[in-house]
Amino acid sequence: LNDLNVSPPELTVHVGDSALMGCVFQSTEDKCIFKIDWTLSPGEHAKDEYVLYYYSNLSVPIGRFQNRVHLMGDILCNDGSLLLQDVQEADQGTYICEIRLKGESQVFKKAVVLHVLPEEPKELMVHVGGLIQMGCVFQSTEVKHVTKVEWIFSGRRAKEEIVFRYYHKLRMSVEYSQSWGHFQNRVNLVGDIFRNDGSIMLQGVRESDGGNYTCSIHLGNLVFKKTIVLHVSPEEPRTLVTPAALRPLVLGGNQL
C-alpha cells in the first residue's frame, strides 16, 4: 500500500495561504481508518517533524502546527486529507501521510511535496479606467468540485456588495456565474474553476472601486477565503497595472 515510490504530487503556495494535501486510498474491504499520522520531512538534514495524528476520534495537531492543521477528509470514507492554513516558509518539505486500518499490519503511505513562495502582495494598485486581475487560488492535490465562488466588496462608503458569484450544483449539473450591482458587465472569471482558481478580472475601473475584495471558494463544506485591498489612483494612461509593492515610477510632465 505504499505510494511513496511514485513521484508525489507537488503543491506550490504563497506564505499565508492554505494548502489541502490529499491522502485518500481505495480499499476493496469495508475496513475503516483506524489511525492517521502526518509527518513533515523538511530535507536538508533537518529532523522530521510530527504534524498531526488521529485515533479513536481524537485528532491532535502537534507543536507549531497547532491551530493550523485539520483533517478535512471523510475519515469514514478512507480520506485522511490534511488542510494546512497560514502556510509559513518553514512548512516547506515533503508531507507523509500514513493510514492504518484496524486489524491490518499494512500501512498506506502517501507523500505530498509542498513548495512555499514569498507572500503575495495583499494590496494592488490600478488607475481609473484600467483593468486589474485579482487572484484567488486554493491549492489542493485533490480534484474537488468547486461548488461556489463568491467575491464581496466593501468600500469606504458603500456597505458590503456582491461583486461576482459562481455556482455549480452537482446534482443538477447547473453552472452559472454572474456579476452584480455596479460591477455588472465589468467582472469576468479568468481562473480555471476546475483547478480551484476563482481569479477575476475587473475592467473599466472606477474610483469608487477602491476598497477590500474578499474571495471565498467553497468546496463542499470547505471554504477558502482571501482578501485583497485595491487602491485606485486618478487616470494615468502611461503606467501599467502593478502590485502596490512594485509601483512604477511616475514621470513628471517634462520627463520622457
Epitope: F34, Y54, Y55, S56, V60, P61, G103
Partner: antibody
Framework: DVQLVESGAELVRPGASKLSCKAL????????MHWVKQTPVHGLEWIGI????????VYNQKFKGKATLTADKSSSTAYMELSSLTSEDSTVYYC????????????????WGAG | VLTQSPASLAASVGETVTITCRAS??????LAWYQQKQGKSPQLLIY???SLEDGVPSRFSGSGSGTQYSLKINSMQPEDTATYFC?????????FGAGTKLEL
C-alpha cells in the same frame, strides 16, 4: 527535570473530588495526559486521556460518567474530577504522560506522577 | 485483553527470568513493559515490544510479535525485585496485564 506533581491524599465525603496533576519542565500542550487507576483487585486500569493542546478527550467506557478530564494551559495542570464517590473509588490514581516514539501506534507512558 | 504469566515467581541473583504476555488479538508490536517497585509509580522499561528505554540496564530485553510477547531479565539483580506489567497501546481502551510479582 520533567515531573508530574499530583495533589496529595484526600479524605472526602461521598460526592465528588477533583484531583490535580501539575506538569513541570516540558511543554504541557505537546503531550497527552492520561489517568490510570490502581487497585489490588483490578490492577492498573486506564481511565482516559486529555490532550491539553487540542482539548480532545477519550474515555474508557467503564469510567464514562465517573471521571471528567480537563486541563488548564495557563497553569500547565491537568485535572480529573470523580463523581458519585463510593468506598470503591478509594485507591491510588496516577497521571502519566505519553511520549511519541515514531508513530501513533507507539506511544508509551514515560513519566508518571507519584500517585 | 492481556493475559500475563506467571502471577508471581522467585529468582536467585544471576538467574535468567522470563515473563510472558498474551494478547487476545494481534497488537502489532504495540506493547510496553513497566516495572513497579513497592510504593512507587510504574517505570517504563521496554516500548515497541523490543526497544529499550533510555537509562534502563541492558539485562532487560523484550521480544515477540502478533499476540505473544515476553520480557527477559538476564542475570537477576536484587534491585529487580518488583512487579512487572505489560501494556498494549494498539487501541483504546489501553489495557494492562494483571502483573507479575518478582521476588528474590
Amino acid at each position: 527535570d520533567v515531573q508530574l506533581v499530583e495533589s496529595g491524599a484526600e479524605l472526602v465525603r461521598p460526592g465528588a473530588s477533583k484531583l490535580s496533576c501539575k506538569a513541570l519542565a516540558y511543554t504541557f500542550t505537546d503531550y497527552e495526559m492520561h489517568w490510570v487507576k490502581q487497585t489490588p483487585v483490578h490492577g492498573l486500569e486506564w481511565i482516559g486521556i486529555i490532550h491539553p493542546g487540542s482539548g480532545g478527550t477519550v474515555y474508557n467506557q467503564k469510567f464514562k460518567g465517573k471521571a471528567t478530564l480537563t486541563a488548564d494551559k495557563s497553569s500547565s495542570t491537568a485535572y480529573m474530577e470523580l463523581s458519585s464517590l463510593t468506598s470503591e473509588d478509594s485507591t491510588v490514581y496516577y497521571c502519566t504522560r505519553r511520549r511519541y516514539y515514531g508513530s501513533s501506534y507507539n506511544w508509551y507512558f514515560d513519566v508518571w506522577g507519584a500517585g | 485483553v492481556l493475559t500475563q504469566s506467571p502471577a508471581s515467581l522467585a529468582a536467585s541473583v544471576g538467574e535468567t527470568v522470563t515473563i510472558t504476555c498474551r494478547a487476545s488479538e494481534n497488537i502489532y508490536y504495540s506493547l510496553a513493559w513497566y516495572q513497579q517497585k513497592q510504593g512507587k509509580s510504574p517505570q517504563l522499561l521496554i516500548y515497541n515490544a523490543n526497544s529499550l528505554e533510555d537509562g534502563v540496564p541492558s539485562r532487560f530485553s523484550g521480544s515477540g510479535s502478533g499476540t505473544q510477547y515476553s520480557l527477559k531479565i538476564n542475570s537477576m539483580q536484587p534491585e529487580d525485585t518488583a512487579t512487572y506489567f505489560c501494556e498494549q497501546t494498539y487501541d483504546v481502551p489501553l489495557t494492562f496485564g494483571a502483573g507479575t510479582k518478582l521476588e528474590l
